[in-house]
């Protein structure tokens, strides 16, 4: 592989590595989405709530004078429960969690999956690297790419969970945003699909510059 | 001013048939579930049913002892919910009432109920 | 279902005393999906509590609710003439929603 060549590997790789801590980021933290509920004017506290894959946290905000829930960072008694995804047997509420709970199983077994695409390129890239394989870029990208896409369809599985819980006439919950950690999963598949894209291009055996040659006239990668 | 109002209850006997109204003024009802409560002469409130807002797929839940007899519908457009009662027994003699819930804004309106009353 | 047993079934107390109805659920409905109501003769329900503990707009404070889990209890700090009802609870944690049978406040 020529030295220009290695070089975009390298950056692309680089790019892959902070898609893959966002990523990783995204999945273990719960601040996705935070809802606010409806106001009564007369508490002096409201509930808000922020969620990830795997609980959802609940907190008990002091109101100031313009009546607003917020923001999730001001000190409160917090609580939060773990969705409870393996264990179905289980009576779930109907308040909150249930909603809740049927999307967060998708899009944790989906996060999974991606995690698992990520551990695969990173073997493959580890291999590439350390036995000079350049071949294995080729799966490794691929693998990357899935797991890109992985994460997008768990952001899209989330975002209609929030949709879901806002629309509900059982949650308190009126008001949402989307949080760092969804933040975190939209650059992760970016980086991840547009990364493995890259890093596949890169890794790619030249393609024949003149009609005459053949892939297989064209120099050797080693 | 807000106002519930329940409209076809009477004297049906053993077997019949009866279906009830309810008719929402001052307040759209889309966004909410609306619930079915029921009382008997001298006795407690028994929950009878509900029916969810469209974006929780117009999903209904019935109490054990009405599940298969009733039927909760609901038409946005009228801003109207219905209780189809079949197969009517006499211990469904009650004042039906209906309310809704919204967020935090639980059985917060109240009909003014509507008396069925199942005799031979 | 949750079957809600409230205790009492009547109290008899003078205007100016302390009521305390108690509600038993027959399992966990947590400490945000349980509501009080009240009802006078040959009215509607009225809700008072929601959540266990917060109160509905127009409510006075003397009337409070606490608990959680299976044990809530609805506190009326002084009885006022117009308090004299029946008091419901009602789960709303799982379906199907349940009432309790009832508790009647009645003057002495």
């Known amino acids: 592989m020529s030295q220009t060549k290695m070089l975009k590997v390298r950056v692309t790789l680089f790019c892959i590595l902070a898609g893959i801590v966002l990523a990783m980021t995204a999945v273990v933290t719960d601040h996705w989405a935070v809802l606010s509920p409806h106001m009564e004017h007369h508490n002096t506290t409201c509930e808000a709530a922020h969620f990830g894959l795997w609980r959802i946290c609940t907190k008990r905000i002091p109101m100031d004078d313009s009546k607003t829930c917020g923001p999730i960072t001001l000190p409160g008694e917090k609580n939060c429960s773990y969705f409870r995804h393996f264990n179905p047997g289980e009576s779930s509420e109907i308040f909150e969690f249930t909603t809740q709970k049927e999307y967060s199983i998708s899009a944790a077994a989906i996060a999974i999956f991606s995690l698992g695409f990520i551990i695969l390129g990173s073997l493959c890239v580890l291999l590439s690297l350390g036995k000079k394989r350049d071949y294995l870029l080729r799966p490794a990208s691929m693998f990357y790419a899935f797991a890109g896409l992985c994460i997008l369809v768990s952001v899209e599985v989330m975002r209609q969970s929030v949709k879901r819980m806002i629309d509900s006439e059982d949650t308190v919950w009126i008001e949402y945003y989307y949080s760092w950690s969804f933040a975190c999963a939209c650059a992760a598949f970016i980086l991840l699909f547009l990364g493995g894209l890259a890093l596949l291009l890169f890794s790619l055996p030249r393609m024949p510059r003149n009609p005459w040659e053949s892939c297989m006239d064209a120099e050797p990668e080693h | 001013e807000v106002q519930l109002v329940e409209s076809g209850g009477g004297l049906v006997q053993p077997g019949g048939s009866l279906k009830l109204s309810c008719t929402a003024s001052?307040?759209?009802?889309?966004?909410?579930?609306m619930h079915w409560v029921r009382q008997a002469s001298g006795k407690g409130l028994e929950w009878v049913g509900r029916?969810?807002?469209?974006?929780?797929?117009?999903?209904?839940e019935y109490a054990a002892s009405v599940k298969g007899r009733f039927t909760i519908s609901r038409d946005d457009s009228k801003n109207t919910a219905y209780l189809q009662m079949n197969s009517l027994k006499t211990e469904d003699t009650a004042v039906y009432y209906c309310?809704?819930?919204?967020?935090?804004?639980?059985?917060?309106?109240w009909g003014q109920g509507t008396l069925v009353t199942v005799s031979s | 279902e949750i079957v809600l047993t409230q205790s009492p079934g009547t109290l008899t107390l003078s205007p100016g005393e302390r009521a305390t109805l108690s509600c038993r659920a027959s399992?966990?409905?947590?400490?945000?999906?349980l509501a009080w109501f009240q009802q006078k003769r040959g009215q509607a329900p009225r809700l008072l509590i929601y959540?266990?503990?917060s109160r509905t707009s127009g409510i006075p404070d003397r009337i409070s609710g606490s608990g959680s889990g299976t044990d809530f209890t609805l506190t009326i700090s002084r009885l006022e003439p117009e308090d004299f009802a029946v008091y419901y609870c009602?789960?709303?944690?799982?379906?199907?929603?349940?009432f309790g049978q009832g508790t009647k406040v009645e003057i002495k």
């Open positions: 959540g266990a503990s």
């Open positions: 001052g307040l759209t009802l889309s966004d909410s579930a």
């Open positions: 309310t809704r819930n919204w967020k935090i804004f639980l059985f917060d309106y």
């Open positions: 009602q789960q709303y944690g799982s379906s199907p929603w349940t």
């Open positions: 029916i969810r807002n469209k974006a929780n797929r117009y999903a209904t």
């Open positions: 399992q966990s409905v947590g400490s945000k999906y």
